[in-house]
Interface confidence: low
């Protein structure tokens, strides 16, 4: 017996959701203090079998319904008969005026029904239920939280359209609102919430609610029945109202492929057809660029790139373009490039700064340091398995082994184009002719040119810099070159067409100090590159005049703002004014210029390159560290 | 989060008046059903009067009706006890609460959250 | 005005015990009947709505009973915080609100 009335009990517990506590929102029921209470008698841990109410519903805000269960009067023990008392809260004091139930029978067994003569939507109501005069279940509540929308009618649905693949299609479903909720005068304001699923599916997709009448659902897929069904509550209260009738949707089928899993086929063909696609992409692909490849497996020679020269013209190979540039004067004749077919063009990249935390390249090669032993250079090396520029000529001097190690790196590392770092490298070609003997032509006259003074010259910014700051060198040894930088690297080319060239390296962290003892230096090489290509050193110690067992010393000043990109030569001087940072060395002692400009274009011999910051001991010299004049040229010349 | 705060407690001769407050914050009082509860020293709980702000409603424990009203004022999200002609018998810590929505059905006018008192004390 | 009658007025247990503590309404009153604990110095706290609905965040030993116009609170085992004073409340939407005397639960 117990077991029937607790099965009766949670049949009408869950026939009810009008006062299911998770459907609504605490927000709204804090609307009014009369709240109403989900109540599941049969879940209930009350050891009394008395009455209780089950639901009350207004399907419209106009009228309401109260249900109740009859537990008692289905066991033994009668109570007598059940009677419904109601009070409208409408006074400001707890009154004990109670009014029996209007109407017992309209809304069912076990139930009152209020009409729109006994429903009032702004009073709050206290209905109870009693028995031979005791209440048993007693509850408030105010009309609108009760408020539960019977189902929304006339469901249909209209195609919207089919995807291209003829796998999923979208419908539009409408309905109206039930024929009892007054919508025109705005009485109601109903929300929507659709439900779908397909047939034999068990678990309802919900979609948000909305406040019209219609909405489309998309991507539902072809060749499948669903379930669509709607059910609405008043806006910002009461609980959703029982779902409307299901509608059936049923898409016809419109692709030629019929395939169970999203048509597995098509995008099987698709994905093949792709593959085949890009694979022939990138033969294509690898085929026109077959030189790039090459250079990317074996690397070309690194050489610094030229400021002041449009890439893209180097890239383009439009070497008429860049001789003129280069060529302002008369003396400098543009058939060099164009005359010899063996000159051509290598795509470096220049190493990140980052990368650049250990010694130049240069540095290692001329190092007189024995005790570093590397088992390679370990910088990426440009050598593109030709002979380089200038590898018989290192390969000739009497470098020790340690220090020399190889001239190519075995390791062919990718390297990374950047679009401003295609440079020019002139090399050999024809591996009979002497790679390092007559290869600049004797056609160049000697030309002294003029540079202006006050000409702003800009700090290479993008040269690598050189961890170590400071490097003691004996010159006694000729080779032993490492703190002159030979990555000559073309920084500017001023008005007066002088080609203004910077060190590639230890030139970030600031500029060498002026205030020292200078020794002209002079650079020749035979194989005359136009860019900046390694300076043989071979070739440089023919014509360095170098002061015996003078010590070279390169300082960095520090007190050079890193950000400031482009230092006059106005600049230089006040530099070399200033007291060095670094302790003070004996006029013996020289920094190595970090500016040097091309001052004569010796026939074949090469270039002769003067150190612009650096004031002449013995010699007539301007004041400012500008640019060198004809007569003190004339003056200073071995 | 919801919070209650009372405030204007103090000492009172009387025959005198006091104002108190009761500042809600992490929910909205226009909504709610405000009470007031006081504890006389080493005490029960007494039940002193309840505002419902949205229907206007208040309601009062039969020792206080007359002398004591409740109010509330929604924009500032407050509720106000005025106590007028104060009895020793008023002396007591003075509780606001809110009372709990339980939501649906089973009605139930428990009070979830309480602030921290405020001491009423009427002596001459 | 209905009367909330609670007993025992205190009582003394060990933790781990169980306690039961009783409130009898005057007259009828449904379900309306919440349950608090309070300890000295602070505000009450709610344990329990509706005659026998825990409220959320209280321990699952706090149970609640009703039968008739007889209420019944329930700590199935004793906890050292549990040391307080109980307290019920009739909340009848038709009458004033009353509280009963208060149970006084101290360690034994």
């Known amino acids: 017996m117990d077991l029937w009335q607790l099965l009766l009990t949670l049949a009408l517990a869950g026939s009810s959701d009008a006062f299911s506590g998770s459907e609504a929102t605490a927000a709204i029921l804090s609307r009014a203090p009369w709240s109403l209470q989900s109540v599941n008698p049969g879940l209930k841990t009350n050891s009394s079998k008395e009455p209780k109410f089950t639901k009350c519903r207004s399907p419209e805000r106009e009228t309401f319904s109260c249900h109740w269960t009859d537990e008692v009067h289905h066991g033994t023990k009668n109570l007598g008969p059940i009677q419904l008392f109601y009070t409208r809260r409408n006074t400001q004091e707890w009154t004990q005026e109670w009014k029996e139930c209007p109407d017992y029978v309209s809304a069912g067994e076990n139930s009152c029904y209020f009409n729109s003569s006994f429903t009032s939507i702004w009073i709050p109501y206290c209905i109870k239920l009693t028995s031979n005069g005791g209440t048993v279940d007693e509850k408030c509540f105010s009309v609108d939280e009760i408020v539960q929308p019977d189902p929304p009618i006339a469901l249909n649905w209209t195609l919207l359209n089919v995807s291209l693949t003829g796998i999923h299609a979208d419908i539009q479903v409408r309905w109206e609102a039930p024929r009892n909720a007054d919508i025109q005068k705005g009485w109601m304001v109903l929300e929507y919430e659709l439900q779908y699923k397909e047939v034999n599916e068990t678990k309802w997709k919900m979609m948000d609610p909305i406040l019209t009448t219609s909405v489309p659902v998309y991507s539902l897929k072809v060749d499948k029945e669903y379930e669509v069904r709607v059910r609405s509550k008043q806006r910002n209260s009461g609980n959703y109202g029982e779902f409307s009738e299901v509608l059936y949707v049923t898409l016809p089928q419109m692709s030629q492929f019929t395939c169970e899993e999203d048509f597995y086929f098509p995008w099987l063909l698709i994905i093949i057809f792709g593959i085949f696609g890009l694979t022939v992409m990138l033969f294509v692909f690898l085929f026109s660029k077959q030189q790039r490849i090459k250079m990317l497996i074996l690397p070309p020679v690194p050489v610094p790139k030229i400021k002041g020269i449009d890439p893209d013209l180097l890239k383009e190979g439009k070497l008429e373009e860049v001789n003129t540039i280069l060529a302002i004067h008369d003396s400098y004749k543009p058939e060099f490039h164009s005359d010899d077919s063996w000159v051509e063009f290598i795509e470096l990249d220049i190493d990140e700064p980052d990368e650049k935390t250990e010694e130049s390249d240069t540095d290692r090669l001329l190092s007189s340091d024995h005790e570093k032993s590397h088992s390679n250079l370990g910088v990426k090396d440009g050598d593109s398995g030709r002979t380089s520029c200038c590898e018989p000529d290192i390969l000739e001097t009497d470098f020790n082994a340690n220090d020399i190690h190889e001239g190519t790196s075995e390791v062919a590392q990718p390297q990374r184009l950047k679009g401003e770092a295609d440079l020019l490298c002139l090399d050999q070609k024809n591996q009979n002719n002497s790679p390092y003997h007559d290869a600049c032509p004797a056609t160049q006259q000697p030309s002294v040119i003029q540079a202006e003074k006050n000409k702003p010259q800009p700090l290479p910014t993008e040269g690598a810099e050189s961890t170590h700051q400071a490097a003691h060198i004996q010159l006694s040894n000729p080779s032993s070159l490492s703190n002159i930088d030979f990555y000559a690297q073309v920084s500017d080319i001023t008005p007066a067409g002088s080609v203004v060239l910077s060190p590639g390296q230890k030139n970030k962290a600031g500029m060498s100090q002026c205030d020292m003892h200078p020794e002209m230096v002079s650079l020749c090489q035979e194989n005359f590159l136009m860019d900046n290509a390694y300076f043989c050193e071979a070739d440089a110690k023919k014509c360095i005049p170098v002061a015996p067992h003078i010590k070279v010393e390169s300082h960095i000043q520090p007190s050079l703002n890193q950000e400031d990109i482009y230092i006059t030569t106005e600049s230089l001087t006040t530099a070399a004014g200033r007291p060095g940072t670094g302790e003070h060395v004996p006029g013996s002692e020289m920094p190595v210029p970090d500016y040097t400009s091309i001052h004569i274009v010796q026939s074949p011999q090469g270039l002769i390159l003067n150190a612009t910051a650096l004031p002449l001991p013995d010699k007539e010299f301007l004041s400012s560290c500008g640019y060198v004049s004809t007569d003190q040229l004339n003056k200073i010349m071995p | 989060e919801v919070q209650l705060v009372e405030s204007g407690g103090g000492l009172v001769q009387p025959g005198g008046s006091l104002r108190l407050s009761c500042a809600a914050s992490?929910?909205?009082?226009?909504?709610?059903?405000i009470h007031w509860v006081r504890q006389a020293p080493g005490k029960g709980l007494e039940w002193v009067a309840s505002?419902?702000?949205?229907?206007?409603?208040?309601y009062y424990a039969d020792s206080v009706k007359g002398r004591f009203t409740i109010s509330a004022d929604t924009s500032k999200n407050t509720a106000y006890l005025q106590m007028n002609s104060l009895r020793a018998e008023d002396t007591a810590v003075y509780y606001c609460a809110r009372r709990y929505w339980m939501g649906g059905y089973a009605y139930s006018m428990a009070l979830d959250y309480w602030g921290q008192g405020t001491l009423v004390t009427v002596s001459s | 005005d209905i009367q909330m009658t609670q007993s025992p007025s205190s009582l003394s247990a060990s933790v781990g015990d169980r306690v039961t503590i009783t409130c009898r309404a005057s007259?009828?009153?449904?379900?309306?009947v919440a349950w608090y604990q309070q300890k000295p110095g602070k505000a009450p706290k709610l344990l329990i709505y509706s005659a026998s609905s825990l409220y959320s965040g209280v321990p699952s030993r706090f149970s609640g009973s009703r039968s008739g116009t007889d209420f019944t609170l329930t700590i199935s085992s004793l906890q050292p915080e549990d040391f307080a004073t109980y307290y019920c409340q009739q909340s009848s939407s038709t009458q004033p609100f009353t509280f009963g005397q208060g149970t006084k639960v101290e360690i034994k």
């Open positions: 007259q009828s009153v449904s379900s309306a």
């Open positions: 992490g929910f909205n009082v226009s909504y709610s059903s």
């Open positions: 505002i419902s702000s949205y229907y206007g409603y208040t």
